[in-house]
């Protein structure tokens, strides 16, 4: 399929002008290469009429132009003073020859329609209302008024002042006078449908003294707005239907031959094919709304229509707006995993691509919710605090310049299953959808922390160990202190007098963190994790409680210690950084030699973890998982 896109059918009237926009993929080569407009001949040859190289054919001289808009990845062909001879098949395209990339366009130029003298032309869109003005002389002020529609030679009455209304105009047509006006009557026809188009005659009085006016009504199908989007990107349909339908249910549907299948409406209907990747946003009280679809697929290309009706379904005679969506498969958006799988108690690291030209943009991660219109509350962002209920288990790691950021979610529960969106406040095309599937764990987690009774005493030394399997042997291990603006990896060199170290026990694949001496500010969530360069892997979390040194301090149950996270005071939740100048972390690669497991510690951790789960609520278990 050619990545060039434009209008398939263009129609106009003799003497008028047309403007044809053609879209091309946003690449440097495409921006600079030759653009052309040629006419397809019967012999298969396409004769150039105009090109961006400056060529202009004789028949287009003085009436056509071709303008490239590289910033929009479009070029526009303007043709004026159209004649019926311009009717034909054309191509708009790119390349040094007319056999390059192109899109076929059919142009039809019709004769100017002929109407009886003094015919007033009314042009209205489907679903709208027309007001036909009928003038009469004073002599017919008290005579019967009527509006009829010409059908061949006959003229069938639509409505008259005796309150007759043709059944096909029932509840749609009204005849009225305005104020004190004695020389005009009006006929309103609402909810216009294509078959309403035609020639109307309004009349006041009977016989030769009657006053007659001709009105030609043209009912226009909505001209589809062309939307050119990359595969995996997102599209927004901005729908503005007007105040008159502000209180009616809204919908977006996709045309399918004769029908239009609803994709989403404000009454809660949603096509399963768009689950997790669609949002409908009411914009204001004037009937405006927008529908956002992310993760565009090849099969999403097609004709779309938005509308309003109390049923939330397409209805003839109600206003609509139309689009034609083209999905360019030559996408700049990288193909990332659309489904990520995790297990309860485990973690996931989700890589979110963004436009590399916008590394300073703010990054966000939201959870798509299937309420009636769909919504996506932001859970974390570069300038957004972690959503309540996700403290200690969610962090966003920006990797400037890499064109991606990573979101890590740990302490997974089955309730975390669902759809999530990666997005930035920059290029809105780069919105990707990920489905997270969390299954019940069937084995021990890869990372385990001991002790699970993580209570440190101020002024003393506190060591916590993270057990990892041999498969992580070659990966970098780290401890980080979680805060509301990320998880700050503990520094790997001494930046202060205080001893806080991370070391690995050669005999048992352990990476340990030591706080020495413990301070009140050390309280909070700590993560143990593995990574390879900027690729983050498994993590596990533990809440370290800090208490004053007291004689005969009671032993705190690990469940209680970790449950504090849920009720952590705001100051703790808001803590913004690890005191890097006072923490030291040493990860010595020489210490990762032995592949022996410590069975007992593992079994003990498993047992404690189970009790930790039992005492937690809302999937926010504080125990190390």
């Amino acid at each position: 399929q050619s990545p060039i896109f434009g209008p398939q059918d263009v129609s106009s009237i003799e003497g008028n002008s047309v403007s044809i926009t053609c879209y091309y993929p946003d690449t440097s080569v495409n921006r600079h290469t030759r653009k052309y407009w040629c006419r397809q001949g019967a012999n298969g040859y396409c004769a150039t009429l105009i090109s961006s190289n400056g060529y202009l054919s004789k028949e287009y001289s003085g009436r056509a132009s071709l303008i490239n808009f590289p910033e929009n990845s479009t070029f526009v062909i303007n043709i004026a003073h159209l004649t019926q001879e311009d009717t034909g098949s054309y191509k708009c395209g790119l390349g040094t020859t007319n056999r390059g990339l192109f899109f076929d366009v059919s142009l039809e130029v019709s004769q100017v329609p002929e109407f009886p003298n003094d015919t007033h032309v009314y042009t209205k869109d489907i679903g709208r209302t027309v007001t036909i003005e009928c003038r009469f002389k004073e002599g017919n002020a008290h005579s019967k008024k009527s509006l009829c529609k010409k059908r061949g030679e006959a003229c069938e009455v639509v409505i008259d002042s005796t309150e007759y209304v043709d059944p096909s105009y029932k509840d749609r047509a009204i005849l009225f006078m305005k104020g004190t006006s004695r020389d005009i009557f009006y006929v309103n026809i609402s909810h216009l449908i294509p078959s309403d188009a035609g020639l109307y005659v309004c009349q006041a009085g009977e016989g030769p003294s009657a006053d007659k006016n001709n009105a030609d009504l043209q009912v226009l199908e909505p001209e589809p707005e062309l939307l050119y989007k990359d595969l995996r990107s997102s599209v927004t349909f901005e729908c503005d239907l007007g105040r008159e339908v502000a209180n009616d249910a809204k919908y977006l549907c996709r045309k399918n031959k004769e029908t239009c299948d609803v994709i989403i409406n404000t009454l809660g209907k949603r096509d399963p094919a768009f689950e997790g990747r669609i949002l409908l946003t009411p914009r204001d009280d004037n009937g405006r709304f927008s529908v956002l679809i992310t993760g565009l697929r090849k099969e999403d290309a097609g004709h779309y229509q938005c509308g309003a009706h109390s049923s939330g379904l397409p209805q003839e005679g109600w206003p609509v707006q139309a689009w034609q969506l083209f999905v360019n498969e030559e996408s700049t958006i990288p193909n990332s995993r659309s489904v990520v799988k995790g297990v309860t108690g485990g973690s996931v690291a989700i890589v979110c691509p963004y436009n590399p030209k916008e590394s300073s943009s703010l990054k966000y991660w939201c959870h798509w919710e299937a309420d009636e219109n769909g919504r996506c509350p932001v859970l974390v962002g570069t300038q957004a605090l972690v959503q309540e209920g996700y403290e200690g288990r969610l962090a966003l790691f920006d990797q400037p310049g890499s064109g991606a950021y990573t979101v890590i979610l740990n302490q997974l529960t089955t309730q975390d299953s669902g759809f999530y969106w990666c997005l930035t406040d920059g290029d809105s095309r780069w919105r990707t959808t990920i489905e997270l599937q969390v299954a019940e764990a069937t084995k021990k987690p890869d990372l385990e922390v001991t002790p699970q009774n993580a209570t440190a005493v101020i002024g003393e030394t506190f060591t916590i160990s993270c057990h990892y399997p041999c498969k992580f042997y070659s990966q970098e291990k780290y401890w980080c202190k979680w805060s509301n603006d990320g998880c700050h990896i503990l520094p790997s060199h001494d930046e202060g007098a205080r001893q806080s170290s991370v070391s690995c026990d050669q005999s048992s694949q352990i990476v340990s963190m030591t706080l020495n001496p413990v301070k009140k500010e050390d309280e909070g969530w700590y993560w143990c994790g593995v990574k390879e360069g900027q690729v983050y892997g498994e993590t596990t979390a533990i809440y370290v409680a800090v208490e004053e040194r007291t004689r005969g301090s009671p032993h705190i149950n690990p469940t209680d210690a970790n449950a504090r996270a849920k009720d952590a005071p705001e100051e703790e939740a808001m803590e913004s950084s690890v005191r890097e100048d006072e923490n030291k972390a040493n990860l010595d690669p020489r210490l990762f030699a032995d592949e022996r497991e410590i069975q007992n510690a593992g079994d003990q951790a498993q047992e404690n973890r189970a009790s930790g789960n039992a005492g937690s609520a809302g999937g926010q278990s504080g125990s190390s998982k």
């Epitope: 966000y364 939201c366 919504r375 509350p377 932001v378 406040d425």
Partner: nanobody, 131 residues
Framework: EVQLVESGGGLVQAGGSLRLSCAAS????????MGWFRQAPGKEREFVAA????????DYADSVKGRFTISRDNAKNTVYLQMDSLKPEDTAVYYC????????????????????????WGQGTQVTVSS
């Protein structure tokens, strides 16, 4: 409920600058779109500037465009109004306002210049520009 406290007002000469701050209480600051309004003596309160909850979208009254800049620091629960090239007609009490929009993708770019759409208001800070 959020409490808003404005500061940074004062007396300044025409052509000078001031930076107003509005500190908000509570953890959910980043679920509010924020705005600045002002009221000159004997006049109606009028819109000055607004910023979306992400900080990614801003809007200004025509009279201050190019001179005033609104910004926010969600980590500090604070919204700022940098006022440069001040004119005597900028003299007014400046109010900070918050609109509850929720931290949602659908409200990422929402800013409002309409007084009635704001849910919480500060007490105001006086700005006087002398000629």
């Amino acid at each position: 409920e959020v409490q808003l406290v404005e500061s940074g007002g004062g007396l300044v000469q025409a052509g000078g600058s001031l930076r107003l701050s509005c500190a908000a209480s509570g953890r959910t600051f980043d679920s509010y779109a924020m705005g600045w309004f002002r009221q000159a003596p004997g006049k109606e309160r009028e819109f000055v500037a607004a910023i979306s909850w992400t900080g990614g979208s801003t809007d200004y009254a025509d009279s201050v465009k190019g001179r005033f800049t609104i910004s926010r620091d969600n980590a500090k629960n604070t919204v700022y109004l940098q006022m440069d090239s001040l004119k005597p007609e900028d003299t007014a009490v400046y109010y900070c306002a918050a609109e509850v929009v929720g931290r949602d993708v659908t409200t990422m770019y929402r800013v409002s210049g309409l007084e009635y759409e704001y849910d919480y208001w500060g007490q105001g800070t006086q700005v006087t520009v002398s000629s």
